[in-house]
Interface confidence: low
Amino acid sequence: HTAAQDNDELVRTHHILIDLRHRPTAGAFNHSDLDAELRRLFRERYRLHPKFVAAVHYEQPTIQIELRQNTSQKAAGDVDIGDAAYYFERDIKGESLFQGRGGLDLRVRGEPLQVERTLIYYLDEIPPKFSMKRLT
């Protein structure tokens, strides 16, 4: 996944911050369960190597997923974090590239995790360029 700079040079996105706000639930999700489920989602659905999911932060109702992938870390055949974020974005928007009816069925210990707002930040290897994408 590449980002176009002002000078038209194509550079690989190395840090993506996915900021989610989930719909109200009876209580907060257990952080470690949430962390495990999101890591599994990226590993099993988007085939992203676990080492590229740098962190999952949670402060109800905000979830932040950090994807990091330096050029030196990425081996041939590794899924690009930009592609994983793109698939995730399409899932969240209900425009999945690989789902049947019902969209992404994301659950933490059986409790549905329903996203009501998503912000995806793409941070490029050549600073200080910055881009932000708002999803509705």
């Epitope: 659905r45 592609d83 590239l97 690989f98 789902q99 049947g100 019902g102 069925d105 994301l106």
Partner: antibody, heavy 121, light 107 residues
Framework: QIQLVQSGPELKKPGETVKISCKAS????????MNWVKQAPGKGLKWMGW????????TYAEEFKGRFAFSLETSASTAYLQINNLKKEDTATYFC??????????????WGAGTTVTVSS | DIVMTQSHKFMSTSVGDRVSITCKAS??????VAWYQQKPGQSPKVLIY???YRYTGVPDRFTGSGSGTDFTFTISRVQAEDLAVYYC?????????FGAGTKLELK
């Protein structure tokens, strides 16, 4: 290891019913959708539909609505394909294929060996 | 339904050759295309998913490329064991659809 084991070949007469099984092992059955694919002799692959292994909800391709039914025995990690009122054009090999993570399909990364159904009078 | 068209039903090749198989979708399917190999009497085996990603354990002589409507599957150096039928499949929207297949055979 991860595998899908299908039931053996079937020889049936037109009008009869056949039920094929696909037993999963080596992974959490309810984490992945299960698809069914038909391959007539000497022909290509045709997606029949899939079943949500979490909810049991089947989705059928238009051509396979009516006489075809997908079902589950979750406790046995097994998916089934039943074909009613068999016709000669149902003669084919039927594959089950594991779909994507969650209640969904993706590409099929694990396949059964296939079950050959022959319909002949 | 999205129609996946593989322009060649057969392709002749020699061991060591480079061969490319094309697949055209009747509408935009983004990068949601997989490639499978099927040998006689066997079930299909996924080689490439999401247009360009090799599935785990697939040799690096197999590559995929493309997006939108035009996709290419390439074997850089054909081995005898690569002789098989290759199918493309779109996983963009139901019903999932396959190409008719391209049989790779020796010259």
């Amino acid at each position: 290891q991860i595998q899908l084991v299908q039931s053996g070949p079937e020889l049936k007469k037109p009008g009869e019913t056949v039920k094929i099984s696909c037993k999963a092992s080596g992974y959490t059955f309810t984490n992945y959708g299960m698809n069914w694919v038909k391959q007539a002799p000497g022909k290509g692959l045709k997606w029949m539909g899939w079943i949500n292994t979490k909810t049991g909800e089947p989705t059928y391709a238009e051509e396979f609505k009516g006489r075809f039914a997908f079902s589950l025995e979750t406790s046995a990690s097994t998916a089934y394909l039943q074909i009613n009122n068999l016709k000669k054009e149902d003669t084919a090999t039927y594959f089950c294929g594991r779909g994507g993570y969650g209640s969904s399909y993706w590409y099929f990364d694990v396949w059964g060996a296939g079950t050959t159904v022959t319909v002949s009078s | 339904d999205i129609v996946m068209t593989q322009s060649h039903k057969f392709m002749s090749t020699s061991v060591g050759d480079r061969v490319s198989i094309t697949c055209k979708a009747s509408q935009d399917v983004s990068i949601a295309v997989a490639w499978y190999q099927q040998k006689p009497g066997q079930s299909p085996k996924v080689l490439i998913y999401s247009a360009s990603y090799r599935y785990t354990g697939v040799p690096d002589r197999f590559t995929g490329s493309g997006s939108g409507t035009d996709f290419t599957f390439t074997i850089s150096r054909v081995q005898a064991e690569d002789l098989a039928v290759y199918y493309c499949q779109q996983h963009y929207i139901t019903p999932l659809t396959f190409g008719a297949g391209t049989k790779l055979e020796l010259k």
